[in-house]
C-alpha cells in the first residue's frame, strides 16, 4: 500500500536569465527511493538513479545541473521554460509517486526596465 506523499515547491516563478531549483520531497513512507525522474510532459530532463547516478538529457545539458540532493537546478531560464515539471519517484516496495511543479518565467521586473530607460 502506498502511504507516502510528495511535497513540492508548487507554483513558482523566476526571472528570465536566472536560475531556479526544482525540488520534491517524499515523506510518510519508509520505501527506498531507487530512481527519481525529472520530466516535462513530452520529454525527460534528467534521471537520478541510485546505481547509475545522474543522466541529463542532451537537450538540457548546457543549462541543467543535478541537485541539490534529488532536486534539479535550471539555469539561464527563458520564457519558453514556463510550464509544468514533474518529479517521479521510483520506490521499493511502494511503486511510483509523482509530484507537479508549475514554473513561470517572467521578463525582468518592471522596476529594472524603468531604471534602464530613465531620462536623467
Amino acid at each position: 500500500m502506498m502511504t507516502g506523499t510528495i511535497e513540492t515547491t508548487g507554483n513558482i516563478s523566476a526571472e528570465k536569465g536566472g536560475s531556479i531549483i526544482l525540488q520534491c520531497h517524499l515523506s510518510s513512507t519508509t520505501a527506498q527511493v531507487t530512481q527519481v525522474n525529472w520530466e516535462q510532459q513530452d520529454q525527460l530532463l534528467a534521471i537520478c538513479n541510485a546505481d547509475l547516478g545522474w543522466h541529463i538529457s542532451p537537450s538540457f545539458k548546457d543549462r541543467v545541473a543535478p541537485g541539490p540532493g534529488l532536486g534539479l537546478t535550471l539555469q539561464s531560464l527563458t520564457v519558453n521554460d514556463t510550464g509544468e515539471y514533474f518529479c517521479i519517484y521510483h520506490t521499493y516496495p511502494d511503486g511510483t509517486y509523482t509530484g507537479r511543479i508549475f514554473l513561470e518565467v517572467l521578463e525582468s521586473s518592471v522596476a529594472e526596465h524603468g531604471a534602464r530607460f530613465q531620462i536623467p
Epitope: N49, E84, I88
Partner: antibody, heavy 117, light 107 residues
Framework: EVQLKQSGAEVKKPGATVKISCKVS????????IHWVQQAPGKGLEWMGY????????KYNETFKGRVTITADTSTDTAYMELSSLRSEDTAVYFC??????????WGQGTLVTVSS | DIQMTQSPSSLSASVGDRVTITCKAS??????VAWYQQKPGKAPKLLIY???YRYTGVPSRFSGSGSGTDFTLTISSLQPEDFATYYC?????????FGAGTKLELK
Amino acid sequence: EVQLKQSGAEVKKPGATVKISCKVSGYTFTDQAIHWVQQAPGKGLEWMGYIYPRDGSTKYNETFKGRVTITADTSTDTAYMELSSLRSEDTAVYFCARGMLRWFAYWGQGTLVTVSS
Amino acid sequence: DIQMTQSPSSLSASVGDRVTITCKASQDVSTAVAWYQQKPGKAPKLLIYSASYRYTGVPSRFSGSGSGTDFTLTISSLQPEDFATYYCQQHYSTPLTFGAGTKLELK
C-alpha cells in the same frame, strides 16, 4: 477503477474523416495526458500523439502529416482523435491510452477503422 | 526520432523455458524504456517501465534490465499464458517509438 472506453468500429471511404472517442472514468481526467496509438492489421504499434486535458496542449507524430487532430472535452471526460484524408493504409485498430507521462498503464479496448471504397 | 530495434522478431519456446528479448535504442535513452505484452484482439498490457520497474500485479517472472541503448526483457520460466507478442517502447521523448515486436510462440 480506471477505465477508458472507446467508440465502436467505423467503416469509411478513402478521403473521408473519422472521429473516435475515448471516455475515461476512475481518475481526474485533467491529471494525465491521453495518447493515441495506431496498430495496422498484423503490424506493430505507432504513436500518433497526445492531448493534456489540463491545458489542452497537444503533440503529434509528424508521420501523420497534419492529418490527425486530438481534442478533449473536460465536461464529459472524453478525448477525441480525428484522422482526415483517409487512405487504405489507415485501416487499423486505434487505441487511446493514459500516460504516466509517456508510458501507458491503461488502454482503451481499441476501435477498428476500415477504409474501403 | 529515436529508433527501437527489437530482436528476435519471433521466438519458439516451451513452458518452463527462460526467454530473453532485446531492444536497442538508436541513442542513449538512459532508463526510459517500457515493455508491453499484447495478445490477439486485445490492448497491450504494461509489464515494465523505466527499464526495470515491474508494474503493479505483473508476475515476478518478468524482469527488465539495461540502460543507455541496450535493454532486455527476461521471462524466467515461461507459463502457458505468456505466449503473446512483446513490444519495447522508449519513453524518453516524443515522438514515442516502439520496437517492431517479438512474437513468442509455443515450440
